[in-house]
């Protein structure tokens, strides 16, 4: 997260860290007791490493009674996701067991109504991604509030040049932005999950390159079918 600040400890109990060989790789969001939603491209970076999901964390390194590391029983990338595109960049991870729910571990309701979020709406994005262009990684969860950007502006030739489909949304990126390591994390508007940070190698913090988020409402049928 660029231009953000440390999040309030355990105030985002849906937040997950998708880890490979014990290292944070991507963000994720608990959407059901045994399921975490993340970005499909995160798995590409996992190679043959052991993928696990950390729930209930604020600090990645410090002991916290709420922290639990879960093995992954099944990884289900969206069937249409491809390495060379950010389309359909969603991944569902089934935990080895149901998560123990409590104050610091709770699923987040996700948007099922397939309607664009009003441009200008302030949404919250959180993660353990880099906090500087130098690549500094935070130990504690960071967050930032970002205004939603209309698709037409986002698709300008000077911005993303038509790459933003109806199944994506954008948020402003003027110094405040999601960045490397935040991919797969939640974009939350009005207490509801609206988007998932895409995992392209986009430049961060440049207002001409807005943040791109996969709209979960557009994938409601797929999410429901996997969770069923």
């Amino acid at each position: 997260i660029l231009g953000g600040r440390e999040a309030e400890a355990h105030a985002r109990p849906y937040m997950a860290s998708v880890q490979v060989n014990g290292e944070h790789l991507c963000g994720g969001v608990l959407v059901a007791e045994q399921w975490v939603l993340s970005a499909a491209h995160c798995l590409e970076d996992a190679a043959d490493g052991k993928v696990q999901v950390l729930l209930g964390a604020h600090s990645l390194s410090q002991p916290e009674p709420s922290k639990r590391l879960y093995d992954v029983l099944r990884a289900v990338p969206h069937p249409d996701s491809r390495p060379d595109t950010i389309d359909h960049d969603l991944l569902l991870l089934q935990l080895s067991e149901k998560a123990t729910l409590g104050p610091a571990v709770r699923p987040l309701p996700w948007q099922r109504v397939d309607r664009d979020v009003e441009p200008g709406t302030l949404c919250d994005v959180a993660g353990w991604g880099i906090v500087s262009h130098a690549g500094r990684r935070p130990d504690r969860l960071q967050h930032v509030l970002l205004p939603v950007l209309d698709r037409a502006t986002c698709n300008r030739r000077t911005h993303h040049d038509g790459a933003i489909t109806q199944r994506m949304m954008c948020a402003e990126s003027n110094r405040r932005d999601s960045c490397k390591g935040d991919s797969g994390g939640p974009l939350v508007c009005g207490g509801v999950l609206e988007g998932v940070v895409t995992s392209g190698s986009r430049v961060c913090g440049n207002r001409k390159k807005p943040g791109i988020y996969t709209r979960v409402a557009s994938y409601a049928a797929w999410i429901d079918s996997v969770l069923a």
């Epitope: 309030e8 355990h10 985002r12 109990p13 709420s66 123990t100 409590g102 104050p103 610091a104 571990v105």
Partner: antibody, heavy 117, light 107 residues
Framework: EVKLVESGGGLVQPGGSLKLSCAAS????????MSWVRQTPEKRLEWVAY????????YYPDTVKGQFTISRDNAKNTLYLQMSSLKSEDTAIYYC??????????WGQGTSVTVSS | DIQMTQSPSSLSASLGGKVTITCKAS??????IAWYQHKPGKGPRLLIH???TLQPGIPSRFSGSGSGRDYSFSISNLEPEDIATYYC?????????FGGGTKLEIK
């Protein structure tokens, strides 16, 4: 010196409501998670509500979910517990408590709530 | 929900003696247990957290140990001011469950 002082307890009829307050001093209130815990007449301690330091998340055990509401005003260094649809089983001494190292490290002296007709 | 079974519910001991209280969790609580002293008209006082870490200002006569599901708390060299009810608290997963309490009396 850390100080937590509860108030607002009293006698209330079944089905009634009550709002408890806890005034905090001697520490930076906005830096701490806070909880309410009650002690029943049988001397059992029961955790009833939790709120993060900025008020961004709350939590209630099933026993009081939908009945109790915890809130805080960090500008006033005060924690609250709104209790509604009170039953005789809610008769207890109610304590506010501060969290540190995730345990409950400082408690107030308690305020007594009696639910009776 | 994890249950905490504390025993004994009451005990009597001599000044200068030693007492031990146990708490058994219904499943592993990863050492996230605290111990409290509670006197009438006051709020409980934290003595120990994370199984064995003594709070500042608490004398070393108080100690705690355990792991997994089984935990114990001891007071040695009993003094008159130790008369109180003692409770264990499980806070694993930030879900807080107390033991039933042990009332300590001096013979």
């Amino acid at each position: 010196e850390v100080k937590l002082v509860e108030s607002g307890g009293g006698l209330v009829q079944p089905g009634g409501s009550l709002k408890l307050s806890c005034a905090a001093s001697g520490f930076t209130f906005s830096n701490y998670i806070m909880s309410w815990v009650r002690q029943t007449p049988e001397k059992r301690l029961e955790w009833v509500a939790y709120i993060t330091n900025g008020g961004g998340a709350t939590y209630y055990p099933d026993t009081v979910k939908g009945q109790f509401t915890i809130s805080r005003d960090n500008a006033k260094n005060t924690l609250y517990l709104q209790m509604s649809s009170l039953k005789s089983e809610d008769t207890a001494i109610y304590y506010c408590a501060r969290h540190d190292f995730y345990a409950l490290d400082f408690w107030g002296q308690g305020t007594s709530v009696t639910v009776s007709s | 929900d994890i249950q905490m079974t504390q025993s004994p519910s009451s005990l009597s001991a001599s000044l200068g003696g030693k007492v031990t209280i146990t708490c058994k969790a219904s499943q592993d609580i990863n050492k996230y247990i605290a111990w409290y002293q509670h006197k009438p008209g006051k709020g409980p006082r934290l003595l120990i957290h994370y199984t064995s870490t003594l709070q500042p200002g608490i004398p070393s006569r108080f100690s705690g140990s355990g792991s997994g599901r089984d935990y114990s708390f001891s007071i040695s060299n009993l003094e008159p001011e130790d008369i109180a009810t003692y409770y264990c608290l499980k806070y694993d997963n930030l879900l807080y469950t107390f033991g039933g309490g042990t009332k300590l009396e001096i013979k």
